[in-house]
């Protein structure tokens, strides 16, 4: 067992992972395939599912993090978050209750989703026992996007970030000391998950997102690959 | 860890009123944390949440009269226009979403009760 | 709006039985259920979450289960503690919102 910096002892029992308790990558369950009795998910479906997906296993880096390091516990995190310049949801985002607008929130979503790659980049070889795990959470996530893509009206307003920076400001983190790289995954792993708790919030307001259909076994489907798209 | 209400007590219709919850040993930027009330012999009533991100949801019959809000050690809730209906011990809790939404509230304080005649 | 809809409303039970209690959502919830024991005078407690997933410190004689939108909490081999009354909580969704709580189910040990 292990306490991450939000206090909850984990454990990797999630409504949608196969039987054998083991994360499915997106796309590899091939149980899934020969199912005929079950109903097409649809695209709110599938987000929602993409982004519990990606939270799990969020959660499985946070754990190794923690048990490696003492960044779950640290008070100096603020003074290492003023530096990195961290996607995070405001009022004016309008993804919150209050003020919701599902374009504006949808544009906030994507744009946040893009701003948050180069920090996915950087978590990659940052994990030992959780390497793939780093890997399936950026995939995922890029999969995540083009769902998000497909949903969204106004494409035109959602900002790509420019690769020169970026490849500018992987180089400057990747060259941090130890400690300050620590931190740095800590307060990416943890921003990401809020940020996508704060999204999932939004996207169950949006319409049709109902629950994920289930199996006669009663486990969830799993799936969500690029061919879905 | 602890959380613990105060501010309930006896008031007429109509007035104004804050309830406070306090928390110890609880880092408030990484936990959600929400107000259910619980009128007297009847169930549990959700008033609200403030999620990590700062962010409110309320019951859609609260929304407007109640508003919460938090400080690093202190999570407020504001009511308004208050009617004997609102007459209740008003409990704060702390959530965990470990994962994703799944807001579970896993420890209570003991409640503070308004009493609206 | 996701309404929690808890049957029965109060049950007897005999010491050493068994006791089930229902818990409908208005619509699916995606196995995100809690389950809380709440005795007179008393805060409500965390029993399980996540559909089955038991709390700390809870007896294992506490079982829950469901899938979708129909959720079950099962005592068994009842004891006098076991005394109190059991609200279901939905956490999939917090907009649209009535009340994130069914109405609460009295156990009554005879």
């Known amino acids: 067992d292990y306490k991450d910096h939000d206090g909850d002892y984990k454990d990797h029992d999630i409504d949608y992972k196969d039987d054998d308790d083991k994360l499915v990558p997106p796309g590899e369950d091939s149980k899934d395939v020969a199912a005929p009795h079950r109903q097409p998910l649809t695209s709110s479906e599938r987000i929602d599912k993409q982004i519990r997906y990606i939270l799990d296993g969020i959660s499985a880096l946070r754990k190794e993090t923690c048990n490696k390091s003492n960044m779950c516990e640290s008070s100096k995190e603020a003074l290492a978050e003023n530096n990195l310049n961290l996607p995070k949801m405001a009022e004016k985002d309008g993804c919150f209750q209050s003020g919701f607008n599902e374009e504006t929130c949808l544009v906030k979503i994507i744009t946040g989703l893009l701003e948050f790659e180069v920090y996915l980049e950087y978590l990659q070889n940052r994990f030992e026992s959780s390497e793939e795990q780093a890997r399936a959470v950026q995939m995922s996530t890029k999969v995540l996007i083009q769902f998000l893509q497909k949903k969204a009206k106004n494409l035109d307003a959602i900002t790509t970030p420019d690769p020169t920076t970026n490849a500018s400001l992987l180089t400057k983190l990747q060259a941090q000391n130890q400690w300050l790289q620590d931190m740095t995954t800590h307060l990416i792993l943890r921003s990401f998950k809020e940020f996508l708790q704060s999204s999932l919030r939004a996207l169950r307001q949006m319409g049709d997102l109902i629950s994920v259909p289930v199996d006669s076994r009663g486990s969830e489907q799993k799936l969500i690959s690029e061919e879905d798209l | 860890q602890s959380v613990e209400e105060s501010g309930g007590r006896l008031v007429t219709p109509g007035t104004p009123l804050t309830l406070t919850c306090t928390v110890s040993?609880?880092?408030?930027?990484?936990?959600?944390m929400s107000w259910v009330r619980q009128a007297p012999g009847k169930g549990l009533e959700w008033i609200g949440y403030i999620y990590t991100d700062s962010s409110t949801y309320y019951a859609n019959w609260a929304k407007g009269r109640f508003t919460i809000s938090k400080t690093s050690t202190t999570v407020d809730l504001k009511m308004t226009s208050l009617t004997t209906e609102d007459t209740a011990t008003y409990f704060c809790?702390?959530?965990?979403?470990?994962?994703?939404?799944?807001?579970?509230?896993?420890?209570w304080g003991p409640g503070t009760l308004v009493t609206v005649s | 709006a996701y309404d929690m809809t808890q049957t029965p409303a109060s049950v007897e039970v005999a010491m050493g039985g068994t006791v089930t209690i229902k818990c409908q959502a208005s619509?699916?919830?995606?196995?995100?259920l809690s389950w809380y024991q709440q005795k007179p005078g008393q805060p409500p407690k965390l029993l399980i979450y996540r559909t089955s997933t038991l709390a700390s410190g809870v007896s294992s004689r506490f079982k829950g289960s469901g899938s979708g939108t129909e959720y079950t909490l099962t005592i068994s081999g009842v004891e006098c503690a076991d005394a109190a009354t059991y609200y279901c909580q939905q956490g999939y969704n917090s907009n649209d919102v009535d009340n994130v709580f069914g109405g609460g189910t009295k156990v009554v040990v005879v």
């Open positions: 619509q699916s919830i995606s196995n995100e």
């Open positions: 040993g609880i880092d408030l930027s990484s936990y959600d």
């Open positions: 809790a702390k959530g965990s979403t470990d994962y994703a939404f799944d807001t579970r509230l896993d420890l």
